[in-house]
């Protein structure tokens, strides 16, 4: 670093990375107090949370959220049926799997029920807002005496829809080696040293075949292979938290 160090742990909660926000709200009324932006994530195509910063309101206001899809049989807005609350004030909406249509434009409207003219509409492409679960069931097998294969599973999402980032290192390495693996949940290491202990972990993103999500999942639980000898300096090789 040319002046001070900025690197940090890779394995922080996903919220510590950049928070996805929607496109700027389209305000539909005469100048009034702007409404907060709505941020939506589709979690593993199991449910979607659309949230807003309720504390940005000058006085406690239970804003309402309505949504529809741009092209659908029923073109009317429907109100959120499962609000999320922060300090007893609405701050989000959870939308269940049955109501998620990834490939239709999602139109979301935030409104102040006390001032109906105070409302804002945003349009979102949900296929670009998918955050997968961390990969699971990491398993290691020997393909040959010195070749190791790592495989993993992703729940509820077709494997061809995902891009993976694999990190591995041995107890003799001071840093991870990183590889990008596209659409196949497996990776082979052609040469391993049986006297070393290896650690592997994987994260994924919904990209680029089925969507263009730019946000990576959390890291999988690490798996280990090889010698169980005590490391000379455990703190040096410890996984980042």
């Amino acid at each position: 670093w040319s002046s001070k160090v900025l690197m940090s742990s890779a394995n922080e909660d996903i919220k510590a990375d950049l928070i996805l926000t929607s496109t700027a709200p389209e305000h539909l009324s005469a100048p009034t107090l702007p409404l907060p932006e709505v941020q939506c994530f589709v979690f593993n195509i199991e449910y979607m949370n659309c949230t807003w910063n309720s504390s940005s309101e000058p006085q406690a206001t239970n804003l309402t959220l309505h949504y529809r899809y741009k092209v659908s049989d029923n073109n009317t807005f429907q109100e959120c049926s499962h609000y999320l609350f922060s300090k007893e004030i609405t701050s989000g909406c959870q939308i269940q799997k049955e109501d998620i249509q990834l490939y239709q434009t999602f139109v979301v409207q935030l409104q102040d029920p006390q001032k109906p003219q105070r409302r804002a509409v945003q349009k979102l492409n949900l296929q670009n807002l998918v955050i997968p679960r961390a990969p699971e069931n990491l398993t290691l097998s020997n393909l040959s005496e010195s070749q190791l294969e790592l495989r993993w599973k992703s729940r509820h999402i077709k494997e061809r829809c995902l891009q993976y980032l694999v990190q591995y290192r041995s107890n003799r390495d001071r840093s991870w080696t990183e590889l990008i693996v596209n659409h196949e949940p497996r990776f082979s290491l052609p040469s391993v040293d049986e006297l070393k202990r290896y650690t592997f972990r994987v994260r994924s993103r919904y990209n680029p075949i089925c969507g263009s999500s730019q946000q990576w999942s959390k890291w999988s639980q690490p798996v280990h292979w090889g010698s169980h000898t005590v490391e000379e300096n455990p703190s040096l090789f410890a996984l980042e938290a």
């Epitope: 160090v5 742990s9 510590a16 928070i19 996805l20 980032l165 001071r174 991870w176 990183e178 040096l236």
Partner: nanobody, 132 residues
Framework: QVQLQESGGGSVQAGASLRLSCSVS????????MSWLRQGPGNECDAVAI???????YYDDSVKGRFTISEDNAKNMVYLQMNSLKPEDTAVYYC??????????????????????????WGQGTQVTVSS
């Protein structure tokens, strides 16, 4: 949503220059760390250049003196100026971002180089091919 959109990739001869651009929307640079990562032919990923909101920069040894990362806050753009390109610079280049977080020097001592995995949001990538 946060969007990182790379452009400027292409095919050039060794020794030539290219300038990659990354258009950033959905957040401000104030509290961010921006990076250019690359995925070479063997699919290994490396962080080649990093810039923070206070203009601290990092360069991988393989590109030091040849590549320059910069930001234009007014235009919400991040750039990578690549000079004296070599065939080994052939890769998919990703613009990537994360929030800036306070870090202690001792943390850096445990890691000799930054990681692609430090960055939770990546663009789609742009291909750079350098032929001899």
């Amino acid at each position: 949503q946060v969007q990182l959109q790379e452009s400027g990739g292409g095919s050039v001869q060794a020794g030539a220059s290219l300038r990659l651009s990354c258009s950033v929307s959905g957040f401000t640079f104030d509290e961010s760390v921006m990076s250019w990562l690359r995925q070479g032919p063997g699919n290994e990923c490396d962080a080649v250049a990093i810039i923070s909101s206070d203009d601290n920069t990092y360069y991988d040894d393989s590109v030091k003196g040849r590549f320059t990362i910069s930001e234009d806050n007014a235009k919400n753009m991040v750039y990578l100026q690549m000079n004296s390109l070599k065939p080994e610079d052939t890769a998919v280049y990703y613009c990537a971002a994360r929030r800036r977080r306070p870090v202690y020097d001792s943390d850096y001592e445990l890691r000799p180089r930054p990681l692609c995995g430090d960055f939770g949001v990546w663009g789609q990538g742009t291909q750079v091919t350098v032929s001899s």
